[in-house]
């Protein structure tokens, strides 16, 4: 007997995945993996007193203990609608169907005499139909529905008389059905039978408080199972050649602190007191776990040596149940002060270590949804995906011998103490309907797909391509607002006098009279901050640097009456010094953040972007910047992420849309000004950058989610792109959606009406498309009331825990960027596109492997868009140069300017212009890469500061 389970908790507690394969395995299950689905007789059969069926303890318990439930009759009526169940099984394509026989349907008072004919006919028909369809039956003899007569006459499982009666019942089933059944389960989850039936009273027969009874029941269940196993082994296995086990259920638990021995011992104790209670005698050494014997002393019945030998090894495989029933209610669980967890992979590892690597059938797995959820059970898909991913990793990575999986349950039905308040089926059943149609839920479609593919195939990805970006591709890095230094930090060359130090021994400087030195003019390198920026940029080896000006520093009053020349000089220095390194600037005029709107104080106090005067002020500010810096700057962004800024004005949807309107007009006016006044001489390009995450339907089987994903893109990107890139007006889809909500009284929001003049003003005011892309969001439709932008969209987001994601929960989904680029081209035509910010937060301060993985995978998808989809992608700007203190770590440099290892990785990307094949050399010489700014360099050298 092994008993090594405790080692499971010694894994590295600080492990955070840095690539997808460490978190989710795209792979198949073993050939001939056994895929199935399960039900319990009491839960789905209905007809609780029809055709001679006797009452069970649960039929009685429902009437006496459960509020608002009259009987189990309202369930899915499988007894009547057998054909519908068979069609449902056909739909999914399972290899097996696990169901239970209702003991009182065969023998109404529990004693084996002549079987109830109608009951016998039902199970015979079911078995024959399964065999005909090539679906293997896995039959459970006891799934909690003890004949009431046995409870009333003997006290149920408290009385060891039941052991022989159960064995008689099992013998009948082996004799009658064994020719068609190769897999038998004696008892489903005996822990719950004992613990909730006799401890908490939450299950039938509803007795509670008597711990001795709990462990007596457990003892009798083990002995009953053992007796049946020996019976099958001796009398039936030789000719029926089947397998028999008992389904044991458990939770999983994680230590509060993985290095605290006592926490780990408590976790072990927790598992042993639930799963070990039954598994230790049956799969272990024939006896209860040591810890239980020590703790429970006289309460726990003893096994004699003969009984230990009798019980030990009485299972042909380990049948394991992992579902909500073992996690409810939390206050009755054996948590030992530790943390309950749904980590099925770890639970399987524990079983492997504790019970010597048995063959495992997952005999029940799944979660639940609320009763109001019909066929769109999106969370159920993700729970299933997560569980199946863990099973696959257990098989492939941990070498655990799982040979089959039972999704629970086939149908919605009666859920024990929860009655009809939750649903666990892959098929939706309206319990109030006459015909009880089985409607496949999204989870049924998903499971069907898993079975068809025998696992998880990587559908989303086109294989990686080898190739390079064009030679004039902008390899950039983005920084947010650069705060200008108000005073040059090195004024030592502006004083014309000569000094001697310590001439009289007083350690002071003495001016030498009559000597005047030539001072040198102020230089850009006087700004210490700029030196830091340049050092970092030089190490990045980028061709472009995107940074933002601080509007409030340049124009403290918000108008041209007080221009901060020192600030402008500082920015000019940043650009000119960069050009000396061959780095061109992409300058953002206005870069608001959620914490700080970045507006000059007077404009902020006047209402910010809700006040049209801010629009005029912005135009004037833009003109000043074009005039002062435009000879050196050839790429301009007017406003960074106006589609996010407007969120700040979220008191109402109308505020949001009003602010957005003013931002659009401000941008358009700035663009028109540049076009008219500056483009002829400066020959630059102007745009605005939009936050542009991609959206996928959280539930690909739900039309409403596909519509929600497109709606997200309309509300997020098209809201600004449509007026500027295309029509001069807001997207029709967005306008109509808000209007329809308005009409139905669900929102008082309305998009502003644009005049013909405004439409003409807005339309076409972009020279390129600038997108900030970080992640892909999984969206679902949810009707939301209220008059805010967020509720107008009727969208909720779902976090897929099986996806690699960053500390701030940004999912790493590389293919999203390619889909975005294709969507933009399809909607707005063939234009130059720059990804003006793209990056991930990574906790690592030195070896930021998540960032490297992100860069590699996202750039690979951008390259596919360029090479395969022919998208005119002109540049990629990684976000961001340096991180800010106590903010998410997006930087290539730490807040104290220490370089991270992703810098070398990005350098290599830049020097090879992408992903060249091994034998191809870099096609681009350094001069070609920076063709854009030979003129700029000339100007830098000639123009005084």
């Amino acid at each position: 007997f092994s008993g090594d389970g405790r080692a499971v908790w010694s894994k590295n507690p600080n492990f955070t995945p840095v690539n997808e394969s460490q978190l989710f395995l795209y792979d198949t299950f073993p050939k001939n993996f056994f895929w199935g689905v399960g039900t319990g007789a009491l839960q789905v059969e209905g007809s609780w007193k029809k055709d001679g069926k006797g009452p069970s303890i649960w039929d009685h318990f429902v009437h006496t203990h459960l509020k608002n439930v009259s009987s189990t009759n309202g369930s899915s009526d499988s007894y009547i609608f057998l054909e519908k169940d068979l069609s449902a099984l056909d739909f999914i394509g399972v290899s097996f169907y696990q169901f239970s026989i209702s003991w009182p349907r065969l023998f109404p008072d529990g004693i084996v005499t002549v079987a109830n004919a109608k009951g016998l006919q039902y199970y015979n028909t079911l078995l024959d139909s399964l065999v005909l369809r090539n679906i293997e039956p896995i039959v459970t003899l006891y799934h909690w529905d003890l004949p009431l007569a046995l409870q009333e006459k003997y006290g149920g499982w408290k009385n060891d008389t039941i052991i022989d009666i159960f064995n008689d019942y099992a013998t009948y089933c082996f004799q009658t059905f064994g020719d068609r059944v190769k897999y038998w389960i004696t008892i489903h989850n005996p822990y719950l039978v004992a613990w909730h039936g006799y401890g908490t009273g939450m299950h039938a027969p509803g007795e509670k408080g008597n711990l001795a009874a709990v462990y007596t029941v457990g003892h009798n269940l083990i002995k009953a199972h053992s007796k049946v196993w020996h019976n099958y082994n001796t009398h039936f296995r030789p000719h029926q050649k089947g397998w028999l086990s008992i389904t044991l259920g458990s939770h999983w638990i994680e230590p509060n602190r993985s290095e605290n021995t006592m926490d780990i011992l408590k976790c072990q104790q927790s598992m042993v007191s639930v799963l070990g209670w039954f598994a230790s005698p049956i799969h272990g050494d024939g006896d209860y776990p040591e810890g239980m014997k020590k703790k429970l002393l006289s309460i726990l019945p003893l096994f004699s040596e003969a009984e230990k030998n009798e019980v030990r090894g009485t299972a042909d495989f380990f049948a394991f149940s992992f579902g909500p029933n073992n996690f409810k209610p939390l206050n009755t669980m054996a948590k030992m002060g530790q943390n309950v967890s749904l980590n099925l992979r770890e639970a399987l590892n524990w079983i492997k270590l504790e019970y010597n690597n048995p063959q495992i059938l997952i005999a029940e797995n799944g979660w639940f949804t609320d009763s109001h959820v019909k066929t769109e059970d999106t969370t159920a898909i993700y729970m299933m995906k997560n569980f199946l991913s863990q099973v696959l990793q257990a098989i492939r990575l941990d070498e655990i011998r799982v040979f089959g999986y039972t999704a629970w349950s086939l149908l919605d039905g009666f859920e024990w103490q929860d009655a009809y308040t939750i649903r666990r089926g892959l098929f939706y059943v309206d319990f109030n309907s006459k015909q009880k149609e089985r409607k496949p839920k999204s989870s049924a479609h998903y499971y069907k797909q898993i079975i068809r593919e025998n696992g998880f195939s990587l559908k989303e990805a086109t294989p990686d391509v080898q190739g390079q970006f064009p030679c004039d591709f902008s390899w950039g890095v983005t920084e947010s607002v650069l705060k200008p230094e108000s005073v040059a930090s090195s004024p030592q060359f502006s004083d014309p006098y000569l000094y001697v130090w310590n001439a009289t021994g007083n350690r002071l400087l003495h001016r030498v009279e009559g000597v005047r030195l030539k001072t040198r003019p102020a230089q850009c390198t006087d700004f210490v901050n700029i030196k830091k920026q340049l050092e970092m940029l030089a190490r990045m080896k980028v061709t472009h640097y995107r940074f933002a000006l601080d509007w409030a520093s340049v124009l403290p009053t918000g108008n041209l009456s007080a221009v901060n020349r020192q600030a402008l000089r500082y920015y000019r220095c940043v650009v000119s010094e960069g050009l000396k390194l061959g780095i061109s600037a992409m300058v953002t005029l206005y870069y608001p953040t959620h914490a700080h709107l970045g507006l000059p104080e007077p404009l902020l106090h006047a209402g910010g972007w809700l006040n049209p005067s801010t629009v005029e002020a912005f135009q004037a500010y833009a003109g000043l910047c074009f005039q002062e810096l435009g000879d050196l700057v050839k790429l301009w962004i007017t406003i960074n992420e106006p589609n996010r800024l407007s969120d700040i004005y979220n008191r109402s949807g109308n505020d949001t849309y009003g602010a957005a309107h003013n931002l659009l007009v401000a941008h358009a006016l700035a663009w028109r000004l540049y076009d008219r006044q500056f483009r002829p001489s400066q020959r630059g390009a102007v745009s605005l950058s939009l936050h542009a995450d991609w959206a996928e339907p959280a539930n690909p089987y739900a039309d409403s989610h596909w519509r929600a994903a497109e709606r997200f893109l309309q509300f997020e990107i098209a809201w600004f792109a449509e007026p500027l890139f295309k029509t001069g007006d807001y997207p029709a889809a967005m306008r109509e959606y808000i209007a329809s909500k308005h009409r139905r009284g669900l929102s008082s929001s309305a998009l502003p009406r644009l005049t013909e003049a405004e439409r003409r003003l807005l339309k076409g005011t972009v020279d390129f498309c600038a997108l900030n892309h970080f992640t892909t969001r999984f969206v679902m439709h949810e009707q939301l009331a209220g008059s805010r932008y967020d509720s107008d969209r009727d969208i909720q987001f779902l976090q897929d825990i099986t996806r690699l994601s960053s500390p701030t929960r940004l999912a790493v989904i590389p293919w999203g960027v390619r889909k975005l680029l294709r969507w933009v081209r399809r909607n707005y035509g063939d234009m130059d596109i720059y990804i003006t910010a793209s990056g991930i937060d990574d906790q690592a301060l030195e070896d930021d492997r998540l960032r490297k993985y992100y860069l590699e995978k996202y750039l690979q998808e951008v390259l596919k868009a360029y090479l395969i989809d022919k998208v005119r992608i002109k540049g990629y700007y990684a976000f961001k140069l340096a991180e800010e203190k106590s903010k998410p770590r997006f930087g290539f440099f730490t807040s104290d300017f220490k370089a991270k290892s992703s810098i070398q990785f990005y350098n290599k990307m830049i020097s090879s212009s992408g992903f060249p094949s091994e034998n191809s050399s870099s096609r681009c010489s350094q001069t070609q890469k920076n063709t854009e700014c030979t003129v700029c360099l000339f100007l830098v050298q000639k123009k005084p500061l």
Epitope: R6, A7, S10, R257, E259, T261
Partner: antibody
Framework: EVQLVQSGAEVKKPGASVKVSCKAS????????INWVRQAPGQRLEWMGY????????EYNAKFKGRVTITSDTSASTAYMELSSLRSEDTAVYYC???????????WGQGTTVTVSS | DIQMTQSPSSLSASVGDRVTITCRAS??????LAWFQQKPGKTNKLLIY???TLQSGVPSRFSGSGSGTDFTLTISSLQPEDFATYYC?????????FGGGTKVEIK
Amino acid sequence: EVQLVQSGAEVKKPGASVKVSCKASGYTFTNYGINWVRQAPGQRLEWMGYIYIGNVDIEYNAKFKGRVTITSDTSASTAYMELSSLRSEDTAVYYCARGRGLGHFDVWGQGTTVTVSS
Amino acid sequence: DIQMTQSPSSLSASVGDRVTITCRASKSISKFLAWFQQKPGKTNKLLIYSGSTLQSGVPSRFSGSGSGTDFTLTISSLQPEDFATYYCQQHNEYPWTFGGGTKVEIK
């Protein structure tokens, strides 16, 4: 470098108490436990008890219960073991050792000799 | 308490020899046994835990095996720095207990 540095040798009279300290460095003190083990001349090693610094979980060997007290001062990254009602058979080298989750000791102190003699 | 019996209590060997030390528990301790090395003037050094897991930084000539009640520490090719006393410790249940030690001396 992860290390545990213990206080110096002590000579005590029977009936007195001794308090041995163990200063940790090179790792996050609160993430691990400290065990105390002693080795009397010619005797085998004997585990006395354990403290998990993060939440002050303490477990004592029943043999020493009532006589041994294990404490810690997180601000000083130091664990202490106090043994009272000393007798001559308590003469031993006392070790502190960092405890890992599975109950093994991966870093040991250099040992503190305690002599109990009248 | 679980009694740990180590054998032999001492042995003489030469550099390059294969050395085996055994440790027996009075009842099953699963695989939760650690081995460590004690040398005068040095701090004790963990070699193996959980029966067979080599502690990081420990040379691969050290290996552990066994489970239940019988365990073995093997040094595949004895090196000059390996002459020391070796102890086993069960870390299966409180109180943790130790073997009596095996002194490995130069032949």
